[in-house]
């Protein structure tokens, strides 16, 4: 059912990284516009992205209110220039999104190595604690603030002169690893949430090598 020349949205997809969350859908509109609504399972519907010709809607402001809630969105289709028009059932044509739980499903963004500091045969590698758009008491929370001990990092490293790699784990944002004196090393990190079954790992950070800015070295 539906009004003439109006088609329902389809392929509703959540795209979310570090809680920045956008709902995308198809098709590109021809003589129609869209409005999005979002709600928690028990909450009221809230309208966003009114009468837009875009095929995406940023819902970050809504989901960051409680990232552990499960959200549902729906996309309404209206004829362009006649947004009061309804379908044959007396309401606009719409399509539901899959459910989305930000805490369990947001992708982990690519981490960044903030610094490394060598003291003798030890190197301390620090991972930047990425800021998210989740707020508490009017301040933005970091990834660690949100995930706590659920968040870990995996370090991959090698001597600059060798292809053989090693790995280390931490559930903080710091690694302390043993290195050979006089050798330079290259590092990359990956974020991980061990308790998840999907979207568990981030992509690797850019590789950072000793002797190329970033670090401090003390004998």
């Amino acid at each position: 059912s539906g009004t003439t020349n109006t088609v329902a949205a389809y392929n509703l997809t959540w795209k979310s990284t570090n809680f920045k969350t956008i709902l995308e859908w198809e098709p590109k509109p021809v003589n129609q516009v869209y409005t999005v609504q979002i709600s928690t399972k028990s909450g009221d519907w809230k309208s966003k992205c009114f009468y837009t010709t875009d095929t995406e809607c940023d819902l970050t402001d809504e989901i960051v209110k409680d990232v552990k809630q499960t959200y549902l969105a729906r996309v309404f289709s209206y004829p362009a220039g006649n947004v009061e028009s309804t379908g044959s059932a007396g309401e606009p044509l719409y399509e539901n999104s899959p459910e989305f739980t930000p805490y369990l499903e947001t992708n982990l963004g690519q981490p960044t190595i903030q610094s490394f500091e060598q003291v003798g045969t030890k190197v301390n590698v620090t991972v930047e604690d990425e800021r998210t758009l989740v707020r508490r008491n009017n301040t933005f929370l970091s990834l660690r603030d949100v995930f706590g001990n659920d968040l870990g990092y995996i370090l991959t490293y090698r001597k600059s002169s060798s292809s053989g790699k090693k790995t280390a784990k931490t559930n903080t944002n710091e690694f302390l690893i043993d290195v050979d004196k006089g050798e330079n090393y290259c590092f990359s990190v990956q974020a991980v949430i061990p308790s998840r079954t999907v979207n568990r790992k981030s992509t690797d950070s850019p590789v950072e090598c000793m002797g190329q800015e970033k670090g401090e070295f003390r004998e």
Partner: antibody, heavy 117, light 107 residues
Framework: QVQLVESGGGVVQPGRSLRLSCKAS????????MHWVRQAPGKGLEWIGL????????IYDPKFQGRFTISADNSKNTLFLQMDSLRPEDTAVYYC??????????WGQGTPVTVSS | DIQMTQSPSSLSASVGDRVTITCKAS??????LNWYQQKPGKAPKLLIY???SLADGVPSRFSGSGSGTDYTFTISSLQPEDIATYYC?????????FGQGTKLEIT
Amino acid sequence: QVQLVESGGGVVQPGRSLRLSCKASGFNIKDYYMHWVRQAPGKGLEWIGLIDPENGNTIYDPKFQGRFTISADNSKNTLFLQMDSLRPEDTAVYYCARDNSYYFDYWGQGTPVTVSS
Amino acid sequence: DIQMTQSPSSLSASVGDRVTITCKASQDIRKYLNWYQQKPGKAPKLLIYYATSLADGVPSRFSGSGSGTDYTFTISSLQPEDIATYYCLQHGESPYTFGQGTKLEIT
């Protein structure tokens, strides 16, 4: 449910090669680190190496580096262990295991490899 | 590389006894230590992870403690089905290393 099934073991002559497979079901290997572990008859467990199937990164115990190669085919959800220049001391049961970052939570049943002339 | 020294290598105890196995790491492994049980012809089974956490479905008579370099695995009241070989595994950094194993028998 989650399952890992190894195959490809058998009897092989010293100096030859063998490729073991580990077929995963119930999850996507690219979401996890995957490992190979072996156990010689009557001996303890020995870690061989790991792969991050998402990007192909591999890390080995140095004693296996160069002779053993871990790879993955994400489209087949399968892990591989290529073993070259095999020696009698490589005789063992070979296990693949899934790593959830805090522990190896699932293991295969193991596939036996015998290196003998 | 981190060495794991597990002791004892074998142990004989009676049903109902308290059994303790230790693993000592050559450096701080920050609790990245697991304990596995292995029965003949079977794959290892996870009992304890992150040094102290009991794996799902594992009886509460099994426990783990420790931090830094020293770790302990305890069976509070030995049962006949606990006859197996037990291994510790450090996975804080590569190469990951297992202890040599402790073969547990019932007297």
